[in-house]
């Protein structure tokens, strides 16, 4: 648990910018959490350099990360889920740089899965359904999730629609007829919790029907 | 303000348990860990453990693990500490004090319960 | 887990003077906070994370350090400053040192 490198310490490598950034997935293994971390510049030479997080932890006073590849791990029940903990990108023991995290603040919810789209041809509209772990999960329950659609052919035009639940109804008449559609999800915690997006569920591709015209109505 | 206030005084024979309450107001009770702090007579102090209100997680000084039980009631904002197996040098003041958690100091003090403990 | 010892443990001072308090761990510590305690009460917070002052506690008092060695400054000291003082380390298992009394010469 030591402190900041003192001046004159570790010259060289304090020329780097070893600014990171984390994020928390809370019960993301059954009653374990996870914490990522990993440097915002992806040309930081990562060897020899550790991470550690002290404070707000269960009974220890530290726990070290693992490191996969370029990105630093630590799976564990040991997070307390109240106030901040200090994060430190060490070497050799010592500290290059720290910050006070509190990691209800950086929860990135698992991505949504089980996307599907069924056409009611009655209705004429799309139900649009998707699935989410957290709604099983004890602490990251409540979520605002962004479902996103666009015409295959507009690659940059996408359309939004926030929601609370898991499906969500799309009007016929507000698509174009006869057209591939892609679709995909993804969740954000809505209460207590902060933090980010999850990651984009895979996408689900439809295709709109031909616009049937009425009995007696005419062609323009 | 905020404030923390705690149980009564308590006499106990060895053996036996005591449960001590501290109700918190004036703030957000599961915003804030609650700590357990003890006074022998004459001593210093001796942090014993913590709860998150907000989870019921605990954290327990491992001197004391498998004697002490902090449970909370959320709905009436009140923290308590069961001391079991009592001995004669458990004889102190037993403290509950709000955990400022972004910085993890005690800002905010119950007024102390005297735990007795004589045969 | 971490030893935190006060020194001295009592320290006879008279009104005005100037009070330096040290706290000093078995291994190094990021934050360190001071309480004062007196006779019949709870402890109140001083300061905290190292330097800064708790709500409410006068401008007279004043912490430094890093590592291992840390200090509680009290640069004149106020009839109502005779107490006992106590460090507190910032991590699990939240020790506390001994204590300083201070007291009236």
């Known amino acids: 648990e030591s402190g900041y490198a003192q001046n004159g310490d570790l010259e060289d490598a304090e020329l780097d910018d070893y600014s990171f950034s984390c994020y928390s997935q809370l019960e993301v293994n059954g009653s374990q959490h996870s914490l990522t971390c990993a440097f915002e510049d992806p040309d930081v030479n990562t060897t020899n350099l550790e991470f550690e997080i002290c404070g707000a932890l269960v009974e220890v006073k530290c726990l070290s990360f693992r490191k996969l590849q370029e990105i630093y791990f630590i799976e564990t029940k040991k997070f307390l889920l109240i106030g901040k903990s200090n994060i430190c990108v060490k070497v050799g023991g010592k500290s290059l740089t720290c910050k006070k995290i509190d990691l209800t603040t950086i929860v990135k919810p698992e991505a949504p899965f089980d996307l599907s789209v069924i056409y009611r041809e009655g209705a004429n509209d799309f139900v649009v359904t998707f699935n989410t772990s957290h709604l099983q999960k004890k602490y990251v329950k409540v979520l605002m999730h962004d479902v996103a659609y666009r015409q295959e052919k507009d690659e940059n035009k996408w359309m939004h629609v926030n929601l609370s639940s898991t499906k969500l109804t799309l009007l016929q008449r507000n698509l174009q007829p006869e057209a591939m559609y892609e679709i995909k999800v993804r969740s954000i915690p809505d209460h207590y919790f902060k933090g980010f997006w999850s990651e984009w569920s895979p996408s689900y591709y439809f295709r709109t029907p031909e616009i049937n015209n009425s009995p007696g109505e005419m062609d323009p | 303000q905020v404030q923390l206030v705690q149980s009564g005084a308590e006499v106990k024979k060895p053996g036996a348990s005591v449960k001590v309450s501290c109700k918190a107001s004036?703030?957000?009770?599961?915003?804030?860990?609650m700590n357990w702090v003890r006074q022998a007579p004459g001593q210093g102090l001796e942090w014993m453990g913590l709860?998150?209100?907000?989870?019921?997680?605990?954290s327990y000084n491992q001197k004391f693990k498998g004697r002490v039980t902090l449970t909370r009631d959320t709905s009436i904002s009140t923290a308590y500490m069961e001391l079991s197996r009592l001995r004669s040098d458990d004889t102190a003041v037993y403290y509950c004090?709000?955990?400022?958690?972004?910085?993890?100091?005690?800002?905010?003090w119950g007024q102390g319960t005297t735990v007795t403990v004589s045969s | 887990e971490i030893v935190l010892t006060q020194s001295p443990a009592t320290l006879s001072l008279s009104p005005g003077e100037r009070a330096t308090l040290s706290c000093s761990a078995s291994?190094?510590?990021?934050?360190m906070h001071w309480y004062q305690q007196k006779p019949g009460q709870a402890p109140r917070p001083l300061i905290y994370?190292?330097?800064k002052l708790a709500s409410g506690i006068p401008a007279r008092f004043s912490g430094s350090g890093s590592g291992t060695d840390f200090t509680l400054t009290i640069s004149s000291l106020e009839p109502e400053d005779f107490a006992v003082y106590y460090c507190?380390?910032?991590?699990?298992?939240?020790?506390f040192g001994g204590g300083t009394k201070v007291e009236i010469k």
């Open positions: 004090a709000r955990g400022d958690g972004n910085y993890w100091y005690f800002d905010v």
């Open positions: 004036g703030y957000t009770f599961t915003g804030y860990t």
């Open positions: 709860i998150n209100p907000y989870n019921g997680v605990t």
């Open positions: 291994s190094s510590v990021t934050y």
């Open positions: 994370e190292i330097s």
């Open positions: 507190q380390e910032w991590n699990y298992p939240y020790t």
